[in-house]
Interface confidence: medium
């Protein structure tokens, strides 16, 4: 017998896709040769529009390729993330989304501030936007707190009328007693434990109004609670000290120059918040005249020695120790200028200035029964005491 | 003591617009929101708008919102709704009420009432 | 906008019964719930606000109660000069809102 060896027909010989380049690279492909193609950086495989983990062909008894050849596409990162309270900017053409095309994140301006870098994003050739540090989610838009329309520096006893954009960050709390409350970034109110004690197993029944000059305005702004936060050391009904809590709103607030957030005191906040340095309390409580305020009023007050403060409320009715480390207190030694029943819960402001924002300094919780009573003072939780267990709370939930 | 007293009845043809006055006495003008209510023959109250004779400040409900337009002249101490373009769905009597007070708080509620202004609007 | 529901439409009763009427929210309003009474060709008369408040000069046999959506007014011994129809209202949240209101009538 002879035997024929038919020698197998040469493949074609494979031309590398643009942007690709194939491997191994022979003179000629015969039967069970095979060869892979490797797209450069920023360039995928697709065959059709069937993204491919890896490609490689073989060279049939035929003289043909088992399958045909792939393309190299340029990775395509996709539409950028919208960034809330932001915007983006395509840098590279209208829509340019592909390898190596850059856009640039921007808050929007007054109210938002920028965090974590500096908005510039490029597409990888993973395929995701990624920032100059290496990061893949946008960037976050964070309010801008202590801002407002005031520039000098119910309990608002012998005060006078805000004006819009006065105190932004001031919360009207109904749905137990009428309370006050701070908002904190975009969706946390500051207010006093006492305030919204009987709704800490229910915050939905918490009516939480911003944007409000007017206590019975039909306009502002509403937000809803998700969840209250009660200082643990807090105890209902046997004094005031920790009396501070958190509300978690279940939305985000759009920020304006009626809605901003007071800042939390840095470290060197104590140095704007010595004995006689000025104050401003802010709510709709009893006023002079004894009707809950129509209005939102203000007042500015001087804080007061400590010792002279426990010492006033060392004389019956109060008891002793009713005055702690944990509060600070404000008003005339004259009186007649003071927070009174209704301001619970909001925010003594005082003014950095270094960096011209106003931040909470106290928050309104305890008087005497006479509001602006001359030899008493407003006793208020200082917030500075509690800017770790804020931040563990507001880092956590 | 504390009294608003509205405007007589009014027969309109459809089209024609309407003012009813509410006049108060007996309390501070300015310290109360005064509402607006409608009630047709036979049915429920529906709240029309309110407003705050202190800064002429006023919420309506949507649904009147080219219905109705709420004044107030605070030297004569009366609030005024103006009713635009009635039709037979306008036939109605409309209140005016204060928003209360009691010791000291206010109530969220209507504490005194107008007797009434009826308007019948017919070809 | 939230609808208040008032329950029964109308109701029969005999001078020193006791009556109840019931006025549902459709969604959680707190206790900014007042009640009205209205006399035949009558403007209406506040009874009770924030849900359990009498106002000054209400007899002491109306009571109202409730919180969140569920509302009673009671009438603890119902007189002749009862006879009225009785409007529930929420000012929780704008724009504020009735009921249709329940017809008291004598047997």
């Known amino acids: 017998h002879h035997h024929h060896h038919h020698a197998s027909q040469p493949c074609p010989y494979p031309m590398a896709p643009p942007n690709g380049h194939l491997s191994p690279v022979q003179a000629k492909y015969i039967l069970k040769d095979s060869f892979s193609i490797f797209c450069e950086p920023g360039y995928e495989l697709l065959q059709g529009h069937l993204p491919l983990k890896s490609f490689a062909a073989v060279c049939q008894k035929d003289g043909s390729w088992d399958q045909p050849m792939p393309s190299c596409s340029i990775v395509d990162c996709g539409p950028p993330d919208d960034l809330p309270s932001g915007r983006v900017e395509y840098i590279t053409g209208p829509e340019v989304t592909t390898y190596k095309a850059v856009i640039q994140y921007s808050c929007e301006e007054t109210f938002y501030t920028m965090k974590v870098n500096d908005g510039k994003y490029v597409c990888e050739a993973d395929g995701f936007w990624t920032s100059s540090k290496g990061e893949r989610s946008p960037p976050v838009c964070e309010p801008v707190c202590g801002l407002s329309a005031r520039t000098t520096g119910g309990r608002i006893y012998g005060g006078q009328k805000a004006k819009p954009g006065d105190f932004p960050w001031q919360v009207l709390i109904l749905g137990g007693s009428t309370a006050a409350g701070a908002l904190l970034y975009d969706n946390w109110v500051l207010t006093a434990a006492h305030a919204i004690y009987e709704q800490k197993h229910d915050a939905s029944s918490l009516d939480i109004r911003l944007g409000a000059l007017k206590r019975l305005s039909p306009h502002y702004t509403q937000a809803w609670a998700e969840a209250v936060f009660i200082h643990e050391g807090y105890t209902h009904d046997a004094g005031f000290d920790n009396d501070i809590a958190l509300i978690k709103l279940n939305n985000k607030v759009v920020i304006n120059s009626n809605i901003t957030p007071i800042c939390l005191p840095r470290k060197e906040a104590e140095s704007f918040m010595r004995t006689d340095d000025i104050g401003t309390a802010s709510g709709w409580g009893l006023t002079q005249r004894g009707l809950l305020a129509r209005n939102l009023m203000y007042v500015d007050i001087p804080i007061v020695d400590h010792q002279k403060c426990t010492a006033a409320y060392e004389k019956p009715p109060y008891s002793g120790g009713s005055v702690t480390a944990n509060m600070l207190c404000a008003g005339l030694e004259s009186g007649g200028k003071d927070s009174c029943r209704g301001d619970a819960g909001g925010a003594l402001v005082f003014l950095d200035n270094e960096t011209q924002r106003w931040f909470v300094g106290g928050i309104v919780s305890w008087g005497s029964m006479n509001c602006g009573e001359a030899g008493q003072y407003g006793v208020y939780t200082k917030v500075i005491n509690y800017i770790p267990w804020i931040k563990n709370i507001i880092s956590n939930f | 003591q504390v009294q608003l007293q509205q405007s007589g009845p009014q027969l309109l043809r459809p089209g024609a617009s309407v003012k009813i006055s509410c006049k108060a006495s007996?309390?501070?003008?300015?310290?109360?929101?005064i509402h607006w209510v409608k009630q047709r023959p036979g049915q429920g109250l529906e709240w029309i708008g309110m407003?705050?004779?202190?800064?002429?400040?006023?919420g309506l409900n949507q649904k009147f919102r080219d219905k109705a337009t709420l004044t107030v002249d605070k030297s004569s101490s009366t609030a005024y709704m103006h009713l635009n373009s009635p039709t037979s769905e306008d036939s109605a009597v409309y209140y005016c009420?204060?928003?209360?007070?009691?010791?000291?708080?206010?109530?969220?509620?209507?504490?005194?009432w107008g007797q009434g202004t009826s308007v019948t609007v017919s070809s | 906008n939230i609808v208040m529901t008032q329950s029964p439409k109308s109701m029969s009763m005999s001078v020193g019964e006791r009556v109840t009427l019931s006025c549902k929210a459709s969604?959680?309003?707190?206790?900014?719930v007042s009640w009205y009474q209205q006399k035949p060709e009558q403007s209406p008369k506040l009874l009770i606000y924030?849900?359990?408040n009498r106002y000054t000069g209400v007899p002491d046999r109306f009571t109202g109660s409730g919180s969140a959506t569920d509302f009673t007014l009671t009438i603890s011994s119902v007189q002749a000069e009862d006879l009225a129809d009785y409007h529930c209202?929420?000012?929780?949240?704008?724009?504020?809102?009735f009921g249709a209101g329940t017809k008291l009538e004598l047997k």
């Open positions: 009420a204060r928003l209360g007070i009691h010791d000291g708080y206010y109530i969220y509620a209507m504490d005194f």
């Open positions: 007996g309390f501070s003008f300015t310290n109360h929101w």
């Open positions: 407003i705050d004779p202190s800064d002429s400040e006023t």
């Open positions: 969604e959680n309003v707190g206790t900014y």
């Open positions: 924030g849900a359990s």
């Open positions: 209202g929420q000012s929780y949240s704008y724009p504020l809102t």
